[in-house]
C-alpha cells in the first residue's frame, strides 16, 4: 500500500480527530463496515471498507483523502485478503481504531 508523506498523514489524522470529536449522534447512523487488518495495506483497505458507507457526509472527506493515497484500483484479491474475515464493526469504532493506528505510524515515522 502506498505510504503518504508526513504532512498528508498528519492531515488525515486531523480529519479523523475532527470526526471523533464532533460526533454527536451515532456516526453514519451506526452503519457497520468490515474490520480490516491494520498491519498491511492500511490506506487502501480502509478505503475499501469505508466506501460502503453512503450518504454520510461526515466521512466523505476521509474517503476522498484515503482515495488520494491509492487513487487507482488495487487488484481484486488484494482487499479481500486484508479484510478481517466476517467481522463487522460500527463506523465510529472503525474510525477510532484507524486513528490509533495512524497516530502510531506517525510517531514511528513510517511515512516516507
Amino acid at each position: 500500500s502506498p505510504v503518504p508523506p508526513s504532512t498528508a498523514l498528519k492531515e488525515l489524522i486531523e480529519e479523523l480527530v475532527n470526526i471523533t470529536q464532533n460526533q454527536k449522534a451515532p456516526l453514519c447512523n451506526g452503519s457497520m463496515v468490515w474490520s480490516i487488518n491494520l498491519t498491511a495495506g492500511v490506506y487502501c483497505a480502509a478505503l475499501e471498507s469505508l466506501i460502503n458507507v453512503s450518504g454520510c457526509s461526515a466521512i466523505e472527506k476521509t474517503q476522498r483523502m484515503l482515495n488520494g493515497f491509492c487513487p487507482h484500483k488495487v487488484s481484486a484479491g488484494q482487499f479481500s485478503s486484508l479484510r478481517v474475515r466476517d467481522t463487522k464493526i460500527e463506523v465510529a469504532q472503525f474510525v477510532k481504531d484507524l486513528l490509533v493506528h495512524l497516530k502510531k505510524l506517525f510517531r514511528e515515522g513510517q511515512f516516507n
Partner: antibody, heavy 118, light 111 residues
Framework: EVKLVESGGGLVKPGGSLKLSCAAS????????MSWVRQTPEKRLEWVAS???????YYPDSVKGRFTISRDNARNILYLQMSSLRSEDTAMYYC????????????WGQGTTVTVSS | DIVLTQSPASLAVSLGQRATISCKAS??????????MHWYQQKPGQSPKLLIY???NLESGIPARFSGSGSRTDFTLTINPVEADDVATYYC?????????FGGGTKLEIK
Amino acid sequence: EVKLVESGGGLVKPGGSLKLSCAASGFTFISYAMSWVRQTPEKRLEWVASISSGGNTYYPDSVKGRFTISRDNARNILYLQMSSLRSEDTAMYYCARLDGYYFGFAYWGQGTTVTVSS
Amino acid sequence: DIVLTQSPASLAVSLGQRATISCKASESVDNYGKSLMHWYQQKPGQSPKLLIYRASNLESGIPARFSGSGSRTDFTLTINPVEADDVATYYCQQSNEDPWTFGGGTKLEIK
C-alpha cells in the same frame, strides 16, 4: 476556492520535449492525488498520468516511458515532463485534482495547448 | 481497454423537457457492487466539470436536475428539466480498469 493553473504548453517538433506545470491552490495539495488529462483536436478526452499523494505514479501504455508525472508538495505544483513527442500528442492538456477511482476528477484547470508539428 | 460508447452523439431538447444520454461499456465497470462510472459536463470554451461520481452520486454544488443511473455496462445521465445553461458536451468515464477511458461525448443543444 480550488484553483488549478496550467502553463508550459507550446509548439514543439516531433521527437522534442516539453515540461508542463500546474499551480494548485485552495485545497491541501499534499492530501490529494493529481492527474493530467488531455483533449485532442477532435474533442476526445484521454487520461495521461496520475500521481498519488504518496508519489506513486500511473500511466497508460500510450505515454509510458515517454511522459513523467511528478509533484512538488512544498510549492503545490504538479509537473508533466513529456519527451519523444509525437503528432498524436497534440492536445489541450488539463491538470485535474483526482479524488480517486471512487470519486473521479473532481476539479480541472483551464488547460494548456501542446502542438507537435514539424 | 474498456471502450465507452455514448449515444446519441448529439441531441436537441426543448427547454423544460428531459434529456437522456446513454453510455455503454465494453465490459463491466463494477467493483464490489460499486459502479466506477463518472459523468462530466464541458461547456463551450471551458474545461470539464464533474457532475456525477460512481454512477449515481451527485457531486457537491451540482443541481438536482442532474441524475445518473445504471450498473455493470449500461449507464444513463438524465437532465430533467433541461435549462438553457445545460448546453454542453457530456462525457462518461470509467475508473475500474487501467487505462481509464472516456466516452466520445454527447452534445446537448436546445431545440
